[in-house]
Interface confidence: low
């Protein structure tokens, strides 16, 4: 580490005095200090002498000696005060520029350490500092305003009490710059626009930034529009607004509009599309199949997408039958707006009952007219089965009726013993009826089929079972000849 002579941290001299500062190191050494007049520099190998024979208040400052070849970068310093009764301050810079929230050092150096007790910082013309200005003082360096704010961009003076009066430094201008995080923030409203030819329209392009230096423009397709700009300062941000007013739109006004803003950090742009149409429109669609099948007891949401301009004047869900004359409860209908011209309407049908199968229609109206979209809802049911013994054309016949949706398949089983349900070990014979007779098949109703099993003689220690199944479940009926009746099972889901 270099060594300075005289070996004191501070040196106090009077104006006109001779000052010699000598620095010695292992290798070559260099001096660094405030820019001031009358210094003479003499270097000789590993030593360097800084001297003046006419010190002035401007020589006040910290002088540092470094050894450039030292890998540890060691240095030594001495602070020189040249105490001039007429000049308590040596101002090293008259303009200081920092970013917001940085510490701002105002470099007014005290020329006499004795004056430290009576120093203060003021704004020019003796005005007090702004409230909440947090600052500290060092006689070697000056005043530091901590975490400077944009609003603290002012002209300051350092004040010292000398013999009961305040002596001011020359002024120091502090410029606190906003930290510009990036290009200006943008809004372009509306995000989408539709108008009928001849209607009025308004598009507003707006940009804001913490710094006033930015540009904003609105362009249609690739043409920059000449629009007067409104400026404002609000919430500590500068705002520039371009408003395009079109009294009577025509097809040439349609297309892509881009709002573009730029500053030193870069450019931002956002776009919207303006559609001009000949007349009002209203389009209904659904991502769902319009023919729906749901198991009874389950729920279903019917969704309709609406694209419309102008806005809807009315809409509702209607049940068109064929069962009850009930109408969907309004609380089960829900509307959400995805954007200005697109809406989704949902009808929630929880725990569907048999009487709720049928056609549901969504109707909407705007100045373009009425439109409707109709869903057909069929309920699925597990099969219900019954078996009777009868004679057909003189032959004993077991007649099985199965009702459900989708159309049930029928299988006959003959098994040994009396049982409510044939299991594999008991089965003697199995007959599949691939084409049972369809007794009824109306839209939105269950399908009823009938299957006949001709039995010449009923074996009394056996069971005849009719089983029906579809995609929802299965049902069966066991017929036991010896008994007065037969055993049935409810449908298995």
């Amino acid at each position: 580490i270099p060594v300075i002579e005289p070996s004191v941290p501070e040196l106090v001299v009077k104006p006109g005095a001779t000052v010699t500062l000598r620095c010695v190191g292992n290798g070559s050494v260099e001096w660094d200090g405030p820019p001031s007049p009358h210094w003479t520099l003499y270097s000789d190998g590993s030593s360097s002498i800084l001297s003046t024979n006419n010190a002035t208040f401007q020589n006040t400052g910290t002088y540092r000696c470094t050894e450039p070849g030292d890998p540890l970068g060691g240095s030594a310093a001495i602070h020189l005060y040249v105490k001039d009764p007429a000049r308590p301050w040596n101002v090293l810079a008259q303009e200081v520029v920092v970013f917001e929230d940085q510490d701002a050092l105002l470099p007014c150096l005290l020329t006499d350490p004795v004056l430290e007790a009576g120093v203060s910082l003021v704004r020019v013309r003796g005005r007090p500092l702004m409230r909440h200005t947090n600052y500290s003082f060092s006689p070697w360096h000056g005043f530091t305003i901590h975490r400077a704010k944009f609003i603290q961009s002012q002209d300051y003076q350092c004040s010292a009490l000398m013999g009961g009066r305040k002596v001011m430094s020359i002024s120091i201008r502090l410029k606190v710059q906003k930290v510009i995080p990036g290009p200006p923030a943008l809004t372009l409203v509306p995000a989408e626009l539709v108008r009928i030819r001849g209607e009025a329209a308004q598009i507003v392009c707006s940009a804001s930034s913490v710094d006033v230096n930015f540009d904003v423009f609105l362009q249609h397709n690739n043409t920059k529009l000449a629009i007067p700009q409104q400026s404002d300062f609000h919430n500590n941000r500068y705002q520039k607004v371009l408003t395009l007013n079109l009294d009577q739109v025509d097809f040439q006004h349609a297309g892509n509009y881009s709002c573009v803003a730029s500053n030193v950090q870069g450019k931002h742009s956002t776009s919207m599309f303006f559609r001009v149409v000949e007349s009002a429109y209203l389009n209904l669609s659904s991502e769902q199949n319009l023919i729906q099948e749901v198991t009874v007891g389950e729920g279903l949401n019917l969704k309709v997408m609406v694209e419309a301009y102008p806005g809807l004047q009315g809409f509702n869900w209607t049940y068109l039958g064929p069962f009850s004359d009930h109408q969907p409860e309004p609380k089960l209908a829900n509307a959400t707006t995805k954007d200005t011209y697109r809406h989704t309407f949902t009808l929630s049908l929880p725990r569907l009952k048999p009487s709720e199968a049928g056609r549901y229609s969504f109707l909407a109206r705007n100045p373009g007219g009425w439109r409707a979209l109709t869903f057909e809802l069929t309920l699925r049911y597990p099969p219900e089965v019954s078996v009777i013994w009868t004679f057909i054309n003189g032959s004993g016949t077991l007649l099985c009726a199965a009702s459900g949706y989708p159309q049930p398949n029928v299988t006959w089983l003959q098994c040994s013993g009396h049982t409510d349900r044939c299991d594999e070990a008991q089965v003697l014979q199995v007959w599949d009826d691939p084409y049972p007779e369809v007794l009824s098949q109306e839209p939105f109703h269950k399908v009823t089929v009938q299957s006949l099993l001709t039995v010449e003689t009923l074996e009394h220690n056996q069971t005849y079972e009719c089983r029906a199944h579809n995609s929802v479940g299965s049902g069966s009926w066991a017929f036991i000849p010896i008994s007065a009746g037969a055993h049935t099972h409810p449908p298995d889901e």
């Epitope: 940009a207 804001s208 607004v241």
Partner: antibody
Framework: EVTLKESGPALVKPTQTLTLTCTFS??????????VGWIRQPPGKALEWLAN???????YYNPSLKNRLTISKDTSKNQVVLTMTNMDPVDTATYYC??????????????????WGQGTMVTVSS | DIQMTQSPSSLSASVGDRVTITCLAS??????LAWYQQKPGKAPKLLIY???SLQDGVPSRFSGSGSGTDFTLTISSLQPEDFATYYC?????????FGGGTKVEIK
């Protein structure tokens, strides 16, 4: 300075039509995003929103009163007028008009009542 | 219509107390909520907009929070001039609806 003032009859008879005028200054109802609304408050009760009119002549009404209310504006006179038909004693209230602050960029629209009139008390009685 | 349920309907508090008023929306209103203060015989005054933004000139002891369906107005240290009735207002959907009000009285 933004100011609004309501004027109209202090007493109306049942079944009559009430006409209230809101005269304002310090802003223009032609400014993009600007609106004026009406709110009422029966004695000792909560506030109830009645209607809004916007710079582009868009109008919105409280559905519970919609077939009785009409809102209109005269931008040249800086006035908004509310008419309410078929008045009933339950309509006795203080009626306020209020400005709906304009759109401030780049923030979203200020859709709230930021300046209010002093209110006018309307009594419905035969 | 969206119902705004304010609670409590009234409360007694002392100067310096921390006071919390809640407003519950019957469905999601995002942050489209304002708080107003009304003194007897006076028009309401806007305190908070967009659920948490403080209106210019309103003391910082007032703050708002919440989004969706649950909202809170907090007065961090009640002052004598804060004794009044407070209302919430939703403007997410028409019709705009106010809460029933909360009367803050001196204990």
């Amino acid at each position: 300075e933004v100011t609004l003032k309501e004027s109209g009859p202090a007493l109306v008879k049942p079944t009559q039509t009430l006409t209230l005028t809101c005269t304002f200054s310090g802003f223009s109802l032609t400014t993009y995003g600007m609106g004026v609304g009406w709110i009422r408050q029966p004695p000792g009760k909560a506030l109830e929103w009645l209607a809004n009119i916007w710079w582009d002549d868009d109008k919105y009404y409280n559905p519970s009163l919609k077939n009785r209310l009409t809102i209109s504006k005269d931008t040249s006179k800086n006035q908004v007028v509310l008419t309410m038909t078929n008045m009933d004693p339950v309509d006795t209230a203080t009626y306020y008009c209020a400005r709906i602050g304009p759109i401030k960029y780049p923030t979203a629209p200020y859709r709230y009542f930021d300046f209010w009139g002093q209110g006018t008390m309307v009594t419905v009685s035969s | 219509d969206i119902q705004m349920t304010q609670s409590p309907s009234s409360l007694s508090a002392s100067v310096g107390d921390r006071v919390t008023i809640t407003c519950l929306a019957s469905e999601d209103i995002y942050d489209n909520l304002a708080w107003y203060q009304q003194k007897p015989g006076k028009a309401p005054k806007l305190l908070i907009y967009y659920a948490s933004s403080l209106q210019d000139g309103v003391p910082s002891r007032f703050s708002g929070s919440g989004s969706g369906t649950d909202f809170t107005l907090t007065i961090s240290s009640l002052q004598p001039e804060d004794f009044a009735t407070y209302y919430c207002l939703q403007d997410s959907e028409y019709p705009w609806t106010f809460g029933g009000g909360t009367k803050v009285e001196i204990k």
